[in-house]
């Protein structure tokens, strides 16, 4: 299974899902553009699955608000998009196997790298 | 009303290239990713590839990587592909599309440009 | 690359009749498929989009259902319009893929 690769635009819903993976414990975002959000390379959480009740989205951070989960669990996430937010989605499970869905955002290569 | 002018049909030698083009019209190309698809006759469609014509970031299937060149021109509305290199197999209709996006399809097409490769 | 396979290469219909076309990935596909209409004139045209999503424009006698792997086309009162080459796409990962098609005829 490759996993997903995306297209979308600002203001589009993308779904993310977790296919192949037994028991999804958390997901992971790798940015094309870090610098476009502010951030450092590389992979940081965005979202875990809680003992109990909803996901647990860390509150600083890019998707506050923008993330959502589709079913009782994580295995099926839904985006609002946000221009930034291209990169490499990893869903993680308990056993430490994990599936990945590559997104592009329309524009994010030029409006990443415009000046201000 | 949104269209995709394709120009007209080549007629073009094997081992030469062919540039085809299409002009977008009713839409800005820079709000959509523009595709292209070949036909061969009597067959089905081939996704080739497709371009974020803001920044030009293109992305081909495998089978046509160095052999399709996607672009686009913003000032003029314009997407281009350009297939080198050609044999009997790339005669085919080409289409040009658009797309908001994975979950939207490919949702406009051209008119398709007919490329016959004979000497 | 994921595979699309439509097992019918053509089938023919009496008008009025309901048609199933049937499309199969050969992995989970999310939902991200979409099908196109291709006139025998070679005008293509989106029909459905995200398996169940009318396209602006396209008759409510379209409809598209499936989940997984399975997916499929119906038309529920088939007229001579009708009459096309019918082709799934998945766009669930790159390359995007297509189906072989379905040559629709009245009989």
């Known amino acids: 299974n490759p996993g997903a690769s995306l297209d979308g635009r600002p203001g589009d819903r993308v779904d993310l899902s977790c296919g192949g993976v037994s028991h999804p414990i958390r997901w992971v975002w790798a940015p094309s553009f870090p610098a476009c959000k502010g951030l450092s390379k590389g992979r940081r959480p965005i979202l875990w699955a809680a003992a109990a009740g909803a996901p647990t989205v860390p509150p600083l951070q890019p998707f506050v608000g923008r993330l959502r989960s589709l079913d009782s669990g994580i295995r099926r996430l839904e985006l609002l998009l946000s221009a930034g937010d291209s990169g490499t989605f990893f869903c993680k499970g308990r056993h430490e196997d994990e599936s990945r869905t590559v997104l592009h955002v329309l524009g994010d290569r030029t409006y990443c790298k415009a000046p201000g | 009303e949104v269209q995709l002018q394709q120009s007209g049909a080549e007629l073009v030698k094997p081992g030469a290239s062919v540039k085809l083009s299409c002009t977008a019209s009713?839409?800005?190309?820079?709000?959509?990713?523009i595709h292209w698809v070949k036909q061969r006759p009597e067959q089905g469609l081939e996704w080739i590839g497709r371009i974020d014509p803001a920044d030009v970031y293109g992305r081909y299937d495998p089978k046509f990587q160095g052999k399709a060149t996607i672009t686009a021109d913003t000032s003029s509305n314009s997407a281009y592909l350009q297939v080198s290199s050609l044999t009997s197999e790339d005669t085919a209709v080409y289409y040009c599309a658009r797309s908001y996006g994975s979950s939207y399809g490919i949702d406009y097409w051209g008119q398709g440009t007919s490329v016959t490769v004979s000497s | 690359d994921i595979q699309m396979t439509q097992t019918t290469s053509s089938l023919s219909a009496s008008l009025g009749d309901r048609v199933t076309i049937s499309c199969r990935a050969s992995q989970d596909i999310s939902n991200y498929l979409n099908w196109y209409q291709q006139k025998p004139d070679g005008t293509v045209k989106l029909l459905i989009y995200?398996?169940?999503t009318l396209h602006s424009g396209v008759p409510s006698r379209f409809s598209g259902s499936g989940s997984g792997t399975d997916y499929s086309l119906t038309i529920s009162n088939l007229e001579q319009e009708d009459v096309a080459t019918y082709f799934c796409?998945?766009?669930?990962?790159?390359?995007?893929?297509f189906g072989g098609g379905t040559k629709l005829e009245i009989k």
């Open positions: 995200y398996t169940s």
């Open positions: 796409q998945q766009g669930y990962t790159l390359p995007w893929t």
């Open positions: 009713g839409f800005n190309i820079k709000e959509t990713y």
